[in-house]
C-alpha cells in the first residue's frame, strides 16, 4: 500500500512539475525591467525565451519573437536546449510511469516490469527536473552578470551629455515557476526510484535438488536463503542503482521586488 | 468603432467633489488603460493619470493624487474620475483617453468651479 | 518629471510650405528595450479633443495624411508638415509617453501667412 502511494504521489508530484517546467518555458517573463533606478517607467520591458515584450502606458503590451537563431547569444540557445531536453524526457518519463503504476493493470505485466519501468521513470524525471534547474540557474546567473555589467555602464560612458537610463534586468516570474517546478520533477523522480525498490519482487532462490539416477551420489545446491532475507548479491531481478537525488544543487532565493507601475 | 462618452458639464461651488464617467465601446474595456487629462481654458494638457480596468491598478500625478481618484466597472465598461476639494483652478475641460498613444479621445467634460 | 519644451510657441506658414516644429524633452524617451523612442505628437482643434498624429516619434496613426511626419531620437524631436493646407490650422501638442507623469509640451500654434 505504502509503495503505492509513494509511486502514485511520486507520479503526481512529477507531473505538477512538468507542467511547470514546460509553462516556464513558454513564459515571457524570464527577466524583467529592473524599476529601483527607474520606478516610474511608462514603458515596461520584459523578456522570454522566445520572444521580447514591452508594455507601453496605454496597457498595450507588443511583444516581438526572435526570428534569429544564429544571432542569439549562446547561453540563451544553452538555456532553450536544457529546457527542451527537460520537458522531452519528462513527458517519456510521464508516458513510461501510466504503464508502470501499481494501481493499472495492463494484461499479464510482472511486477519486475513495473519496477524496471518505475524505475526508468524516476531516473528521467530527476534528469529532467536537473535539466531545468540547470537551464533557468544558467538564465539567472547570465542576468546577474549583465545586471552588474549595466549597473557599472550606467556611472561610466556619456559623462552625463545626454540623460539616457541603460535598461537593466532582473529576475522574472518564469525563474521561480521554473526552479520549483524542476525542484518537484526531482523530488518526483527520488519518489518514483523509491517507489521502485518497493516494487520488486521479493526473490526466492530455492534451488532443486538435482537427483542423478546412475549414481548414489545426491548433489545439494546450497545459498537458497540469500533472496529473502534481502542481503547478499542479487543481479537477477533487482537493479542496483544509486537514488541519484543529489542535493548539491541548492537554490538560493533572491528577494523580488513587485512593482506595479 | 472605438468611442468614449463622457458626462455632461458640471457646476460646481468651491470645496465640493465632482464625479464624471467615461463610457467605453468598440474594444475590449479591460485590455487598455484609461487616462484622464486636464485642459484650462485657454491652457495646454495637464495628465492627471489612469486606470487599469484589468486590474483595478491605478497611477497619478503627484499634483492630483491626492484629490483624484479613479475607478472603473467592468459590467458597464464605464471608468470614473471624482475630483474633491475643488478650487477655481479646477475649472476646465476633463478628457478621457485610451489606445496606443491615446488615440481615443472623449469629448470632454466642462466642469465649473464657481462661488 | 521630464519637461517638454516646444518651440516655437506660435508659426505662421503659407499655403502650400513646409512647417516644422521642435520639441525637446528633458530626459532620453528611447526605451532600450524596442529601441524606440516614446513621444507623441497631437494636433488639436478649437472646441475639439485632440487627434492623435504621431506616436513613437514617427509612427503614423491610420488616417494622417502622410504630409505629417515625425523624426527625432533621444531628447529632440520634429513634426514636419510638408505641405501645409487650411485644415492643418491647429495647435500642436508633443507629449512624453516614456515615464511617468506624462508631460506634455507648451503647445505651438500654427497660422497660415
Known amino acids: 500500500m505504502a509503495v503505492t502511494a509513494c509511486q502514485g504521489l511520486g507520479f503526481v508530484v512529477s507531473l505538477i512539475g512538468i507542467a511547470g517546467i514546460i509553462a516556464a518555458t513558454c513564459m515571457d517573463q524570464w527577466s524583467t525591467q529592473d524599476l529601483y533606478n527607474n520606478p516610474v517607467t511608462a514603458v515596461f520591458n520584459y523578456q522570454g525565451l522566445w520572444r521580447s515584450c514591452v508594455r507601453e502606458s496605454s496597457g498595450f503590451t507588443e511583444c516581438r519573437g526572435y526570428f534569429t537563431l544564429l544571432g542569439l547569444p549562446a547561453m540563451l540557445q544553452a538555456v532553450r536546449a536544457l529546457m527542451i531536453v527537460g520537458i522531452v524526457l519528462g513527458a517519456i518519463g510521464l508516458l513510461v510511469s501510466i504503464f508502470a503504476l501499481k494501481c493499472i493493470r495492463i494484461g499479464s505485466m510482472e511486477d519486475s516490469a513495473k519496477a524496471n519501468m518505475t524505475l526508468t521513470s524516476g531516473i528521467m524525471f530527476i534528469v529532467s527536473g536537473l535539466c531545468a534547474i540547470a537551464g533557468v540557474s544558467v538564465f539567472a546567473n547570465m542576468l546577474v552578470t549583465n545586471f552588474w555589467m549595466s549597473t557599472a555602464n550606467m556611472y561610466t560612458g556619456m559623462g552625463g551629455m545626454v540623460q539616457t537610463v541603460q535598461t537593466r534586468y532582473t529576475f522574472g516570474a518564469a525563474l521561480f515557476v521554473g526552479w520549483v517546478a524542476g525542484g518537484l520533477t526531482l523530488i518526483g523522480g527520488v519518489m518514483m526510484c523509491i517507489a521502485c525498490r518497493g516494487l520488486a519482487p521479493e526473490e526466492t532462490n530455492y534451488k532443486a535438488v538435482s537427483y542423478h539416477a546412475s549414481g548414489h551420489s545426491v548433489a545439494y545446491k546450497p545459498g537458497g536463503f540469500k533472496a529473502s532475507t534481502g542481503f547478499g548479491s542479487n543481479t537477477k531481478n533487482k537493479k542496483i542503482y544509486d537514488g541519484g537525488a543529489r542535493t548539491e544543487d541548492e537554490v538560493q532565493s533572491y528577494p523580488s521586488k513587485h512593482d506595479y507601475v | 468603432q472605438v468611442q468614449l462618452v463622457q458626462s455632461g458639464a458640471e457646476v460646481k461651488k468651491p470645496g465640493a467633489s465632482v464625479k464624471m464617467s467615461c463610457k467605453a465601446s468598440?474594444?475590449?474595456?479591460?485590455?487598455?488603460?484609461i487616462h484622464w487629462v486636464k485642459q484650462a481654458p485657454g491652457q495646454g494638457l495637464e495628465w492627471i493619470g489612469y486606470?487599469?480596468?484589468?486590474?483595478?491598478?491605478?497611477n497619478y500625478n503627484l499634483k492630483f493624487k491626492d484629490r483624484a481618484t479613479l475607478t472603473s466597472d467592468t459590467s458597464s465598461s464605464t471608468a470614473y474620475m471624482e475630483l474633491s476639494r475643488l478650487r477655481s483652478d479646477d475649472t476646465a475641460v476633463y478628457f478621457c483617453?485610451?489606445?496606443?498613444?491615446?488615440?481615443?479621445w472623449g469629448q470632454g467634460t466642462l466642469v465649473t468651479v464657481s462661488s | 518629471d521630464i519637461v517638454m519644451t516646444q518651440s516655437p510657441d506660435s508659426l505662421a506658414v503659407s499655403l502650400g510650405e513646409r512647417a516644422t516644429i521642435n520639441c525637446k524633452s528633458s530626459?532620453?524617451?528611447?526605451?532600450?528595450?524596442?529601441?524606440?523612442?516614446?513621444l507623441i505628437w497631437y494636433q488639436q482643434k478649437p472646441g475639439q479633443p485632440p487627434k492623435l498624429l504621431i506616436y513613437r516619434a514617427s509612427t503614423r496613426d491610420s488616417g494622417v495624411p502622410d504630409r505629417f511626419s515625425g523624426s527625432g531620437s533621444g531628447t529632440d524631436f520634429t513634426l514636419t508638415i510638408s505641405s501645409l493646407q487650411a485644415e492643418d490650422v491647429a495647435v500642436y501638442y508633443c507629449?512624453?509617453?516614456?515615464?511617468?507623469?506624462?508631460?506634455f509640451g507648451g503647445g505651438t500654434k500654427l497660422e497660415i501667412k
Open positions: 486606470i487599469s480596468p484589468g486590474n483595478g491598478g491605478s
Open positions: 507629449q512624453n509617453d516614456y515615464s511617468y507623469p506624462l508631460t
Open positions: 468598440g474594444f475590449t474595456f479591460t485590455s487598455y488603460n
Open positions: 530626459q532620453s524617451l528611447f526605451n532600450s528595450g524596442n529601441q524606440k523612442n516614446y
Open positions: 483617453a485610451t489606445g496606443r498613444g491615446f488615440a481615443y
